[in-house]
């Protein structure tokens, strides 16, 4: 059984602030590159996905993340903090279309959640959200 | 209901876990009115970077 998935849960919504990711020469790619495919490893920060007239899922480019100091980390300099957030939306029903970013339900919910987080964390430090995943409650 | 899991990125030193959760909880009422999203069971934790897909996905119960 072969196949691969779309870059489903890789969404970065950002508010225009920038920070820079530094990589060592050993890195295969920057940690914030946009994947064309992914299987079960949505570890990248990508951009907000939108439906386009060209009938494809479009990923706009992401400003690089910035930081004043360089670190010895092979993947990312210090300068960025990540938080895992989980919550229930009790007045919505899960269905299988929430497993696929090309569906209207997925895109509408993702858009609302993305906008909501931009409202909540308006302060300058917020860089964005990524790895969004929906599952039944 | 729908469970939403995601990762938030902030410039280092601008916010901590407690504040991420507090600000999110304070917004829940507005989220209900503005986006018609009734939010509950909020959970926030630190993610060491580079975070693996495994660590991301296995936070749920």
């Amino acid at each position: 059984a072969s196949g691969s998935a779309s870059g489903s849960a890789s969404t970065l919504v950002h508010n225009g602030t920038s920070a820079r990711a530094t990589t060592t020469p050993a890195s295969k790619s920057t940690p914030f590159s946009i994947p064309s495919h992914h299987s079960d490893t949505p570890t990248t920060l990508a951009s907000h996905s939108t439906k386009t007239d060209a009938s494809s899922t479009h990923h706009s480019s992401v400003p690089p993340l910035t930081s004043s100091n360089h670190s010895t980390s092979p993947q990312l300099s210090t300068g960025v903090s990540f938080f895992f957030l989980s919550f229930h939306i009790s007045n919505l029903q899960f269905n299988s279309s929430l497993e696929d970013p090309s569906t209207d339900y997925y895109q509408e919910l993702q858009r609302d959640i993305s906008e909501m987080f931009l409202q909540i964390y308006k302060q300058g430090g917020f860089l964005g959200l990524s790895n969004i995943k929906f599952r039944p409650g | 209901s729908v469970v939403v899991q995601l990762t938030l990125a902030f410039r280092e030193g601008t916010i901590n876990v407690h504040d991420v959760e507090t600000q999110f909880n304070q917004y829940k009422t507005e989220a209900a009115s503005r986006y018609n999203l009734t939010i509950s069971d909020v959970s926030v934790s630190d993610v060491p970077f580079p975070f693996s897909a495994q660590s991301h996905h296995h936070h749920h119960h």
Epitope: G3, P42, S96, S102, D104 | H57
Partner: antibody, heavy 117, light 107 residues
């Protein structure tokens, strides 16, 4: 690489039930959906239903409601499809297809179920 | 239910030929359409997801496009391993439905 391995071929009598398993192997997680699809001889593929592994969430095609039951065993990374009250027209190859960031990303090899008296 | 009308039901072609398969949806499905390949032995593999995105490991000779309610799978230069049956699949609304299939045979 993710692989979906289905149970072996079955021969059943009309009125009986059959339970087909679909085990995910390789680098995988317990939180994803499995769709079940069947293909009768000379017929188009037909969607039967969906289950989100590790939960009791299911969706069924109305055509099969009441006869098909989808279940899963998270610890074994296995999904099951049970079809009851079998009739000759249920003779088909049954496929599972799992999600991985999008629907129907990976497919099992198929399980032939023959219903014959 | 959403009907997918796939054409042609079969075609004969030679290695190197450009092959086009079309699927017409009875209702608006946006970009929620996949293309699948079924080998003669029965194994199914997804080639294209979300109308036009190529799955990893799938050769670039395969492409998907859309014009209104018509969805197209194109094989730019047919290879020996491409002789198989191709299906479109919509997942815009339940029950998810499939096209009738197109069998690509050697001329």
């Amino acid at each position: 690489e993710v692989q979906l391995v289905q149970s072996g071929a079955e021969v059943k009598k009309p009125g009986a039930s059959v339970k087909v398993s679909c085990k995910a192997s390789g680098y995988t997680f317990t939180s994803y959906g499995i769709n079940w699809v069947r293909q009768a001889p000379g017929q188009r593929l037909e969607w039967m239903g969906y289950i989100y592994l590790g939960s009791d969430y299911t969706e069924y095609n109305e055509k099969f409601k009441g006869r098909v039951t989808l279940t899963s065993d998270t610890s074994a990374s296995t999904a099951y499809m049970e079809l009851s009250s079998l009739r000759s027209e249920d003779t088909a190859v049954y496929y599972c297809a799992r999600s991985a960031g999008s629907l129907f990303a990976y497919w099992g090899q198929g399980t032939l179920v023959t219903v014959s008296s | 239910d959403i009907q997918l009308t796939q054409s042609p039901s079969s075609l004969s072609a030679s290695v190197g030929d450009r092959v086009t398969i079309t699927c017409r949806a009875s209702q608006d499905i946006g970009i929620t359409l996949n293309w699948l390949q079924q080998e003669p032995g029965g194994a199914i593999k997804r080639l294209i997801y979300a109308t036009s995105s190529l799955d990893s490991g799938v050769p670039k000779r395969f492409s998907g496009s859309r014009s209104g309610s018509d969805y197209t799978l194109t094989i730019s230069s047919l290879q020996p391993e491409d002789f198989a049956t191709y299906y479109c699949l919509q997942y815009a609304s339940s029950p998810y439905t499939f096209g009738g299939g197109t069998k690509v045979e050697i001329k």
